[in-house]
């Protein structure tokens, strides 16, 4: 499986504020859709605070594998990176240098909203196309870790919500995409 | 691994209103595109809406538009189906289902253990 | 609406082969009607067996495995056992709209 990475265009952009890729045209059912259904767009921070923050959406732009089968055409994704603020930075005790604030919760920029795509993947030796849909990253988004509770707390970023909520990798590869994962592993 | 628990069964009037309720444990709810699927008795399955993540948006079947409302609360991880003008035919075992960890979206692979919705005057 | 059309039953014998179809009443079943297929036994909610038109799951045994067959979408049985006795449907995609067929109530003897 040689064919991973197809070119790594990593961008700097803000959360809320990026361009994602359109999902390929669909069948013309547009009829059934509700009116007001779906997730409203979360923004993290409005853009005065933006100086303040660190929170990077990353396009990688890749080819996908799914067992021996790779996607006809590259597929754009985003991973979440950087450290969340607000915050002053103080060098810990070996010299690197962290976020700090006082009694101690960090914040950790991960994904929020997720899409699906459809992706076309090709299989050697003639066998048949397969199709599926795939989990990307659409934004990302600060959440807190309160070093007082478990540590695998994750709270929304902002007055919003208080309720811990878990935070996860955007399906890091369940099944022959695994591969195509490792490489952003430590991203977020 | 994710688990969902529904409310319990209820018995209605026609023309009156049910919400059932779903909720989700093990995982976040705004992470994850739910479906509800009901069967009446003796019957097949069949499905009512649910998220779609391509469009970002809940999508209802034709058959319930203009009658059946979809919504999720957040704060509780709990996901409610609303049907109203309920009729005689509305009687049914109603089903949550959910989509599943993995890089690739598969739908309907978690589901609840069903609420039975009886409509009788 | 689409119309998802399965067989209404049939049988196999323990050990025996057995193929279950899903036709679209649109045209030929495409791996872009992302086929999945399920099992149902009586006072259950049913369980996904093929995701994807092939791609199965955790839990399923090996005897299942699904397929496209002359324009429909099909879920072979290979080696049946007796707890495979059981209702099956399949589901397709119609661009975000999902409709369930009929379902095969299957009987193993």
């Known amino acids: 499986q040689g064919w991973q990475a197809f070119r790594n265009d990593a961008t700097e952009v803000i959360p809320g504020l990026g361009e994602y890729p359109e999902p390929p045209p669909e069948n013309n059912q547009t009829m059934n859709r509700a009116e007001n259904g779906g997730r409203p767009p979360h923004h993290p921070y409005d853009a005065k605070d933006v100086s303040e923050y660190s929170c990077r959406e990353l396009h990688y732009t890749r080819f996908l594998t799914d067992g021996p089968c790779r996607s006809a055409k590259p597929v754009t994704e985003l991973v979440c990176s950087g450290q969340c603020g607000p915050a002053r930075l103080l060098p810990n005790a070996i010299g690197r240098v962290k976020w700090w604030r006082p009694n101690g919760p960090d914040f950790r920029c991960i994904p929020d909203r997720y899409r699906a795509q459809r992706v076309q993947l090709l299989c050697p030796g003639g066998a048949a196309p397969r199709s599926r849909k795939v989990r990307l990253v659409a934004s990302c988004k600060c959440k807190r870790l309160t070093r007082f509770h478990n540590q695998s707390e994750l709270k929304d970023f902002g007055p919003e919500t208080a309720r811990p909520q878990k935070g996860r990798k955007p399906r890091p590869g369940a099944r022959g995409a695994k591969a195509n994962q490792a490489e952003l592993e430590n991203a977020y | 691994e994710v688990q969902l628990v529904q409310s319990g069964a209820e018995v209605k009037k026609p023309g009156a209103s049910v919400k059932v309720s779903c909720k989700v444990s093990?995982?976040?709810?705004?992470?994850?595109?739910m479906h509800w699927v009901r069967q009446a008795p003796g019957k097949g399955l069949e499905w009512m809406g649910g998220?779609?993540?391509?469009?970002?948006?809940?999508i209802y079947a034709q058959k319930f538009q203009g009658r059946v409302t979809m919504t999720e609360d957040t704060s509780t991880d709990t996901a409610y189906m609303e049907l109203s003008s309920l009729r005689s035919e509305d009687t049914a075992v109603y089903y949550c289902?959910?989509?599943?960890?993995?890089?690739?979206?598969?739908?309907?692979?978690?589901w609840g253990q069903g609420t039975l919705v009886t409509v009788s005057s | 609406q689409a119309v998802v059309t399965q067989e209404p039953s049939l049988t196999v014998s323990p050990g025996g082969t057995v193929t279950l179809t899903c036709g679209s009443s649109?045209?030929?079943?495409?791996?872009?009607?992302?086929p999945y297929w399920f099992q149902q036994k009586p006072g259950q909610a049913p369980r996904t067996l093929i995701s994807?038109?092939?791609d199965k799951h955790s839990w399923t045994p090996a005897r299942f495995s699904g397929s496209l067959l002359g324009g429909k979408a099909a879920l072979t049985l290979s080696g049946a056992q007796p707890e495979d006795e059981a209702e099956y449907y399949c589901?397709?995609?119609?661009?975000?709209?999902?409709?369930f067929g009929g379902g095969t109530k299957l009987t193993v003897l």
């Open positions: 994807d038109t092939d």
């Open positions: 998220f779609d993540p391509e469009g970002g948006e809940t």
């Open positions: 289902a959910t989509d599943t960890e993995g890089y690739w979206e598969k739908f309907f692979q978690h």
């Open positions: 649109t045209g030929a079943v495409t791996i872009d009607h992302y």
């Open positions: 589901l397709l995609d119609y661009g975000g709209t999902f409709v």
């Open positions: 093990g995982y976040t709810l705004s992470e994850l595109s």
